[in-house]
Interface confidence: low
């Protein structure tokens, strides 16, 4: 099933031992399989709506786990369950975020409940962090510097939510979803409410649709927690990543004050952000303002994450803290440190959904149905999982990004790395830090690393051992065909030359260049035979990476020229009569129409440009039914489009002046437009830097009205895929042996 | 020992431009956030705009707010301050000084601003 | 924004009297206020941090007390280096008003 095969992917096969028919009690002491672990059940740690949390020992290393499981009687619940994972996955590997493990699943035909099971494997942590608070409650209120720790590192976890591509919103940020690890540090839980997306409303907005919204968002989040915006969605403020920039105020005060600003959960004082700082406080004055800033009523008005965790760390500067440091004088008071187990005493009682302690597993009320379904469960997930099995499982196991410390560094697979850019000065207290990646890099793979630096920056190739691949292209640009066809050919044959050598990859991120020359290595090396699939490894070994369909473009590019049967650019030149845009795009201000002009790029040289004065362009209404700006230009090889809006703008002394606004881009080889093709078809989806959806009409399409030339016109040098055998190509080579 | 110096100020007209530097020594620059403060000849003191270590957090008065950009660069231990469409209302010395968080601990001598046709 | 005003604007005593300046903030500010000193020709110079921190350097003959909207500087003994003109601060987030000054002049 699909469900089967998206959970085969996301951790390798997993067979739920002989545990499928026994009741949640009769778990403990069974042995499960999952994955490579054999793991012995030993206890239940909490429980709630049909979930359960064990503490879970693999008999092989005797390490302990956190052990989930989870049943599922309908479609909807299952999903939701698949997006937690899928979450949880991408989170992993940031040192403040549970670390997940593994995951598996049986359907409801092979299990004597009659329900499907999901088994989900993190770290076990020590326990929750309210615990702990609780205990030190005695000894008086908490340190400015314990507070800074704790908060700090929570929101080095939030931050990391935020940061992803389409940013993720936990929802339901809370104390209680805070775990203590045996190091002493802070690890964020529970992504059962987290979802991508965001709501704008408007004036237009229907009240049934505020009651949907309000309905969904109600279900995954906590009363004390809920924002003004949620509360009252007439104020149409907008609810996306604030909603949880306001939790963490509310999660700081309380640490602060022991007590919830909003202890009641009244509407009206959340609406109107009634709460108050105690007045004769000393002691967390150098909170006070991040608070205020933090509990602001409207959302565009709070702190970004970035600016609180900056925040922060002047504080920290200040205070002369590390604020990533372990959080020792809370293990102190809980029996020694470290130690991997929690007392052995009776388990903890068992509350409702998200109480007691979950290991590093918060249990999430599941009975209701879920919103917010994964991107890729919507549409075309068939083939992308039928791609997905095709691959041993083994090679897609998990490798938690963060390979060490706080290294922005993902192992997409043993033998390629993405990080972000390895910055040096102060610069690098917010990036990886050149001298760590070098050590990093050193001491995993000495003298085996070649570093592919795909960003307009350098830095002195010395620094990595002179094996550095100064190989960028233009922010917001697919790469050159050529350009990306030689990174794949260079890195393919340093991995040839010796099984222990690795690719690292970093742009500015780690994010789109990395994605889109990673992708296209992939596929190059025949490990996937679509973008889609390729992409879709990316994201979850490190993060959706936000590339445009000019990327994915080209990324097909390179699965078509190294397919069984491989399409080779051709080497004829294209007139380009037209553009032709259907139906007229509408960004006048009167939303009636637009007055377009356009601009040829060919490489990065622009070869045309059809923009005039103001009153002599074109303006095309919406009655129109097209656009269509004449261009009559030849081009050949990399080709970017850009088509812009013009717009009169009173200059000084109210001369007319023109201003442009970027419509949209294209950007393609020409090499792959069929030799008999008069006409090139891009829908909404395959333009890249579009504007809001509301300017473009139902069915938007842009046309280039074209004529490909009979005879090849090759170019000055070669282009390398022409001397190049595709043959030996095999995606073992992505792999190190023992996989 | 802490050190504080502005430059970039002098006579522009209204509307013009005008881009003050301040050099930073003798402490972490990219471990505080910086702020500029100015003073017009004979009044009191008016914050103008402040900046976090990282360049993240910027905060700005509203009577600069759109016209002045402050910004920093790290690796050059630099605080800058870019003031467009100014008024005869800015003419003032504008000082530079190291945010605290909440106060203004060191502060430069000041560098004179003069917007007059 | 929230408004600063410090009384008196200006103030003549001489070496050796205890002085106090007062700011009142518009809205309360916790403790969010700050005293400094300014001399002709020259920066302005932290004596107080937080309303009642001194900053490391400045005499102990200078404090600072109050919280919420009414806070004072006190000088205990004025000695001839300190006749120059007194500014409170509110660092309240997020706009750092000042206030319009009091100006101690020599009796």
């Known amino acids: 099933s699909l469900l089967q095969s998206a959970l085969d992917f996301l951790a390798g096969p997993g067979s739920l031992g002989g545990a499928s028919g026994r009741d949640q009690s009769d778990f403990v002491g069974q042995t499960v399989e999952l994955g490579e672990l054999r793991l012995r059940v030993r206890r239940v740690l909490a429980e709630g709506g049909f979930a359960f949390v064990y503490e879970a020992q693999d008999v092989g290393s005797g390490r302990e786990y956190a052990l989930k499981r989870l049943l599922s009687n309908e479609e909807e619940k299952n999903r939701a369950i698949i997006q937690e994972v899928c979450f949880m996955k991408k989170l992993s590997g940031h040192p403040n975020i549970v670390q997940f493990c593994s995951a598996a699943s049986i359907g409801k035909e092979e299990s004597d409940t009659g329900q499907a099971e999901f088994l989900l494997l993190t770290e076990l942590c020590k326990g929750q962090l309210v615990e702990f608070l609780k205990k030190m409650e005695s000894r008086g209120p908490l340190s400015c510097d314990t507070v800074l720790k704790i908060f700090y590192q929570t929101c080095r976890a939030v931050q990391h939510m935020h940061r992803q591509k389409p940013p993720i919103i936990h929802r339901d940020l809370k104390v209680e979803n805070l775990l203590l690890s045996n190091q002493g540090t802070i690890k964020l839980c529970d992504f059962g409410s987290a979802t991508t997306i965001s709501h704008y409303p408007d004036y237009s907005w229907s009240a049934q649709r505020r009651a949907l919204v309000e309905e969904e968002i109600t279900r995954n989040t906590t009363p004390m927690y809920r924002t003004p915006e949620i509360i009252d969605l007439y104020s149409n403020f907008p609810i996306g990543e604030k909603q949880d920039i306001w939790a963490l105020g509310c999660i700081l005060y309380l640490l602060c004050f022991r007590q919830h600003p909003f202890e009641d959960g009244a509407k009206l004082r959340i609406v109107n952000g009634k709460y108050s700082i105690p007045p004769h406080d000393t002691q967390y004055t150098v909170f006070h303002s991040l608070i205020r800033a933090m509990l602001q009523v409207n959302p565009e008005e709070r702190l970004s994450i970035a600016e609180v965790v900056h925040q922060l760390q002047e504080i920290a500067a200040a205070r002369n803290v590390n604020p990533k440091s372990p959080i020792t004088e809370l293990l102190e008071q809980n029996g020694g440190y470290g130690s991997a187990t929690l007392s052995r005493g009776p388990p903890p009682p068992v509350g409702p959904a998200g109480s007691g302690y979950s290991g590093g597993l918060a249990l999430a009320e599941y009975d209701q149905p879920y919103g917010g379904f994964l991107d890729i469960l919507r549409g075309g997930t068939e083939r992308l999982f039928t791609n997905l099995k095709d691959t041993s499982s083994k090679v897609i196991q998990s490798v938690a990004n963060y390979a060490k410390g706080d290294l922005d560094i993902s192992y997409i697979t043993s033998r390629i790395a993405v990080m972000s850019f390895p910055a040096e000065g102060v610069e690098s207290a917010l990036k990886n830090n050149i001298e760590d990646v070098r050590l990093f890099l050193d001491s995993k793979h000495p003298g085996h690393y070649a570093v592919y630096n795909l960003s307009p920056r350098t830095y002195r190739p010395s620094r990595f051992h002179n094996r550095v691949s100064e190989c960028g292209w233009a922010a917001r640009r697919a790469p050159h065909l050529h350009t990306l066809y030689n990174i794949c050919r260079n890195m393919h044959a340093w991995l040839r030359q010796d099984h222990k050598n690795v690719c690292v990859v970093h742009c500015m991120d780690g994010r789109a260049a990395s994605a889109v020359a990673v992708c296209s290595f992939l596929c190059f090396c025949r490990l996937f035979s679509t973008a889609e699939a390729a992409v879709y490894m990316f994201s979850m070994k490190r993060c959706p990476p936000g590339i445009w369909p000019s990327h994915k473009r080209y990324i097909e590019y390179m699965c078509d020229m190294v397919a069984e049967e491989p399409i080779t650019p051709h080497s004829k030149p294209i007139l380009v009569r037209a553009v032709v845009m259907t139906p007229v795009p509408l960004f006048s201000k009167q939303r009636s129409g637009c007055r377009p002009f356009c601009e040829v790029y060919v490489g990065d040289e622009r070869v045309a440009s059809t923009s005039q004065e103001y009153d002599k362009m074109r303006d095309f209404k919406i009655e129109d039914g097209k656009a269509v700006i004449p261009l009559g230009v030849t081009v050949q090889g990399d080709v970017l489009i850009v088509i812009y809006h013009a717009r009169s703008t009173l200059g000084g002394r109210l001369q007319a002046k023109m201003a442009s606004m970027k419509m949209f881009q294209i950007q393609f080889h020409t090499g792959f437009v069929p030799r008999n093709a008069t006409t090139v078809k891009f829908a909404k989806y395959d333009l890249d830097a579009c504007d809001i959806q509301e300017k473009y009409p139902d069915l938007f399409q842009v046309n280039l009205e074209v004529e490909v030339e009979p005879r090849d016109r090759p170019s000055r040098e070669a282009p390398p895929w022409e001397n190049s055998s595709m043959r030996g190509l095999n995606p073992k080579i992505l792999f190190s042996s023992r996989e | 020992e802490v050190q504080l110096l502005e430059s970039g100020g002098g006579l522009v007209q209204p509307g013009g431009s005008l881009r003050l530097s301040c050099a930073a020594s003798g402490f972490t620059f990219g471990g505080g956030g910086m702020s500029w403060v100015r003073q017009a000849p004979g009044k009191g003191l008016e914050w103008v705009s402040s900046?976090?270590?990282?360049?993240?957090?910027?905060y700005y008065a509203d009577s600069v707010k759109g016209r002045f950009t402050i910004s920093r660069d790290n690796s050059k231990n630099t605080l800058y301050l870019q003031m467009n469409s100014l008024r005869a209302e800015d003419t003032a010395v504008y000082y530079c000084?190291?945010?605290?968080?909440?106060?203004?601990?060191?502060w430069g001598q000041g560098t004179l601003v003069t917007v007059s046709s | 924004d929230i408004q600063m005003t410090q009384s008196p604007s200006s103030l003549s005593a001489s070496v050796g009297d205890r002085v106090t300046i007062t700011c009142r903030a518009s809205?309360?500010?916790?403790?969010?206020l700050n005293w400094y000193q300014q001399k002709p020709g020259k920066a302005p110079k932290l004596l107080i941090y937080?309303?009642?921190s001194l900053q490391s350097g400045v005499p102990s003959r200078f404090s600072g007390s109050g919280s919420g909207t009414d806070f004072t500087l006190t000088i205990s003994s004025l000695q001839p280096e300190d006749f120059a003109t007194y500014y409170c601060?509110?660092?309240?987030?997020?706009?750092?008003?000042f206030g319009q000054g009091t100006k101690l002049e020599i009796k």
């Open positions: 937080a309303a009642s």
């Open positions: 000084a190291r945010w605290g968080w909440s106060y203004l601990d060191y």
């Open positions: 900046i976090s270590s990282s360049g993240y957090g910027t």
């Open positions: 809205q309360s500010i916790s403790s969010y």
């Open positions: 601060q509110q660092s309240y987030y997020p706009l750092y008003t």
